[in-house]
């Protein structure tokens, strides 16, 4: 988790002087509770936005937006703590909006936005906005949280972001898999425009089960430049194991931008359909 660039971040708007500061995610008001605290944020919205760095790289960011409730507690609102928690790693990053002037009611509802948390493809986050100061230990909570799922690199807009392109998202191998006679699979895919090797992983499963019954690898050496964008054809021999009939083929490239952690593409061959056996017709009619 990180913030997009480190140029000065602003949260000021007409009628409010505000600055964005790094936060330890442990506001002082936890340790020194105040008597009067503001109410919680209203209408917290998290959206996927895209932003360029100063170097021109494009990254997915969490666009966080919320409004204030129209009650007198805004007189005690000193700022907000924005927290983003990556759920699979428990990594957390926070920033603090510090209000340098007192808020006053005006004809429009106060609205705040922040779009500088860089998020990763195919990850889930919990976004929390805490109004500051935080409540006393038994006080009503004054935060709002929402979960936010970032699409993977198959998503049209995500595909062209720097992290996705670095992991090989622009390569479309257009995998085809056909079953041949004598327990063989013919795998065909389009090579990318880079002289790098590929690894094919075949995993076979019984019908309707997820425990593999056979696993095999095939290594494809780096193609020559004249083979770029050409189809590569590989014949894999299956093991004649009864019922081991559903096959998943994964292709892992080793592009220079992602090395041994590139996006894999896969195709699956289902077990052949079993013909429905018709009910046997008795050759005599019972008399009862």
């Amino acid at each position: 988790l990180r913030l997009l660039d480190h140029r000065a971040l602003v949260c000021s708007q007409p009628g409010l002087n505000c600055t964005v500061k790094n936060s330890t995610c442990l506001d002082d008001s936890w340790i020194h509770p105040r008597n009067l605290t503001p109410s919680s944020p209203k209408d917290l919205q998290i959206q996927l936005h895209f932003a360029h760095t100063q170097q021109g790289d494009l990254f997915p960011v969490a666009h966080i937006e919320w409004t204030l409730q129209t009650d007198a507690s805004i007189l005690y609102l000193e700022g907000a703590e924005l927290s983003v928690l990556q759920l699979n790693t428990n990594e957390r990053l926070c920033v603090r909006f510090e209000f340098l002037s007192k808020l006053r009611h005006h004809h429009r509802r106060w609205r705040f936005t922040f779009s500088h948390f860089v998020v990763d493809p195919d990850q889930e986050y919990e976004v929390t906005v805490h109004h500051l100061p935080k409540p006393i230990p038994d006080g009503d909570p004054n935060h709002q949280s929402k979960n936010f799922l970032v699409p993977d690199c198959e998503h049209a807009r995500m595909k062209v972001t720097t992290p996705c392109m670095s992991s090989g998202s622009l390569w479309d191998p257009n995998i085809t898999v056909e079953t041949l006679e004598a327990h063989q699979l013919r795998v065909s895919f389009t090579l990318w425009n880079e002289s790098t090797h590929y690894q094919i992983l075949l995993t076979s499963f019984p019908h309707m089960e997820n425990h593999s019954c056979f696993e095999h690898m095939h290594h494809i050496p780096a193609p020559r430049p004249e083979e770029f964008h050409q189809r590569s054809n590989v014949t894999l021999t299956l093991r004649n194991l009864k019922g081991c009939c559903r096959h998943q083929v994964q292709i892992q490239p080793f592009f220079s931008s992602c090395l041994n952690d590139c996006l894999r593409h896969s195709a699956t061959v289902s077990c052949p359909e079993m013909p429905d056996t018709p009910e046997p017709i008795p050759d005599y009619m019972p008399l009862w």
Partner: nanobody, 112 residues
């Protein structure tokens, strides 16, 4: 959390032998496994793999000199490397392709 830990590397003279080991902790493996290697300033390259039934395949440059094997009861993958050449100098990595797990590598240096 699955971890792959390689060992057995070292400095050896040309023509010598080593046996590399890779222990998988945190899970049992009966899956396809592989060895890769990476020489300084070069791309990581395939060395050998073994499938779930014990079938093996080797890169042309090591065929006949290297032998991949496994002991599922010990959760261990091996690479026996014989008739070593200076061009075999590299960091050797163990790979569990199904989950794309990689070890940290073990250094093999062959002196002429």
């Amino acid at each position: 959390e699955v971890q792959l830990v390689e060992s057995g590397g070292g400095l050896v003279q040309a023509g010598g032998s080593l046996r590399l080991s890779c222990v998988a902790s945190g899970s049992t493996f009966g899956n396809a496994m592989a060895w890769y290697r990476q020489a300084p300033g070069k791309q990581r390259e395939f060395v050998a793999h073994i499938n779930s039934l014990g079938g093996t395949n080797y890169a042309d440059s090591v065929r006949g000199r290297f032998t991949i094997s496994r002991d599922n009861s010990k959760n261990t993958l091996y690479l026996q490397i014989d008739s070593l050449k200076p061009e075999d100098t590299a960091v050797y990595f163990c790979n569990w392709p199904r989950y794309n797990y990689w070890g940290q590598g073990t250094q093999v240096t062959v002196s002429s």
